[in-house]
Amino acid sequence: MMTGTIETTGNISAEKGGSIILQCHLSSTTAQVTQVNWEQQDQLLAICNADLGWHISPSFKDRVAPGPGLGLTLQSLTVNDTGEYFCIYHTYPDGTYTGRIFLEVLESSVAEHGARFQIP
């Protein structure tokens, strides 16, 4: 029986060009976490395996950093990074727990102000 729950940072926003930490936490279970997969929509971003450590997908290596902990740090954010992110906890003996985070990447305030002043 799966008794655990995933707590996430929920809906978050960050500025374009900045960075953000995606965090999930599994609680209320004694199950052993064997692996955590991080996905963006249908793309595998990174994996943290209890035995093998971190693997970052090559296409994201420049902008994704492991941690802190089982979390994931996204850097040099673009508007295209807006969307759903999933942390998938593989545990033994419970099975799989999934958490969802929605990230909205906003134009930076500097860019917004610049745009305002350019409008006649």
């Epitope: 064997t34 395996n49 035995d51 093998l52």
Partner: antibody, heavy 118, light 107 residues
Framework: EVQLLESGGGLVQPGGSLRLSCAAS????????MHWVRQAPGKGLEWVSG????????SYADSVKGRFTISRDNSKNTLYLQMNSLRAEDTAVYYC???????????WGQGTLVTVSS | DIQMTQSPSSLSASVGDRVTITCRAS??????LNWYQQKPGKAPKLLIY???SLQSGVPSRFSGSGSGTDFTLTISSLQPEDFATYYC?????????FGGGTKVEIK
């Protein structure tokens, strides 16, 4: 260099048993999940069974469930497949395979042929 | 079980040709799709993992794309050593399943 060396294949009669072994070297065996995959003569690849790095979790294809048992001895760097109640349709080359991050098979053994025939 | 359908089952091509092989899953598998190459009498070899990541040591003429249910393996310029059988495989859930294979033959 990663090496996976299967052994234990051969000719066996229907209803008989065989135990396949896979000796692993060149990597930390206890850190990796492992699979058995088979290939019948002239056919495609079929996943048979998998086991977690510590041996605590196992899974099987429906076609072998209840007849085959996967196990490992991390102190001996060896993976096993105990095959009972063998059938003609189990005839195949059996590959031992290392699984990276539970997602992709990055190394395969050379395979061992199991022939079930009377 | 997730069914993997590969097409075509075989194709004839010449050295230098661009070759595309497709793989379709019976349900969404995110990007949990791998591609392997197998030559007669040999074990399979990993080419692409997680839909689009090139395995270390594999030539850059191989590329993978797709997500969800539809995936593609592309060989940008076919070389003599590329004549082989190619398999896709999903690792989204057990039982792990393979496509039926695509045999790439010399025209």
């Amino acid at each position: 260099e990663v090496q996976l060396l299967e052994s234990g294949g051969g000719l066996v009669q229907p209803g008989g048993s065989l135990r396949l072994s896979c000796a692993a070297s060149g990597f930390t065996f206890s850190s990796y999940a492992m699979h058995w995959v088979r290939q019948a003569p002239g056919k495609g690849l079929e996943w048979v069974s998998g086991i977690s790095s510590n041996g605590g979790s196992t899974s099987y294809a429906d076609s072998v469930k209840g007849r085959f048992t996967i196990s490992r001895d991390n102190s001996k760097n060896t993976l096993y497949l105990q095959m009972n109640s063998l059938r003609a349709e189990d005839t195949a080359v059996y590959y031992c395979a290392r699984v990276a991050y539970s997602v992709w098979i990055d190394y395969w053994g050379q395979g061992t042929l199991v022939t079930v025939s009377s | 079980d997730i069914q993997m359908t590969q097409s075509p089952s075989s194709l004839s091509a010449s050295v230098g040709d661009r070759v595309t092989i497709t793989c379709r899953a019976s349900q969404s598998i995110s990007s949990y799709l791998n591609w392997y190459q197998q030559k007669p009498g040999k074990a399979p070899k990993l080419l692409i993992y997680a839909a689009s990541s090139l395995q270390s040591g594999v030539p850059s003429r191989f590329s993978g794309s797709g997500s969800g249910t539809d995936f593609t393996l592309t060989i940008s310029s076919l070389q003599p050593e590329d004549f082989a059988t190619y398999y896709c495989q999903q690792s989204y859930s057990t039982p792990l399943t393979f496509g039926g294979g695509t045999k790439v033959e010399i025209k």
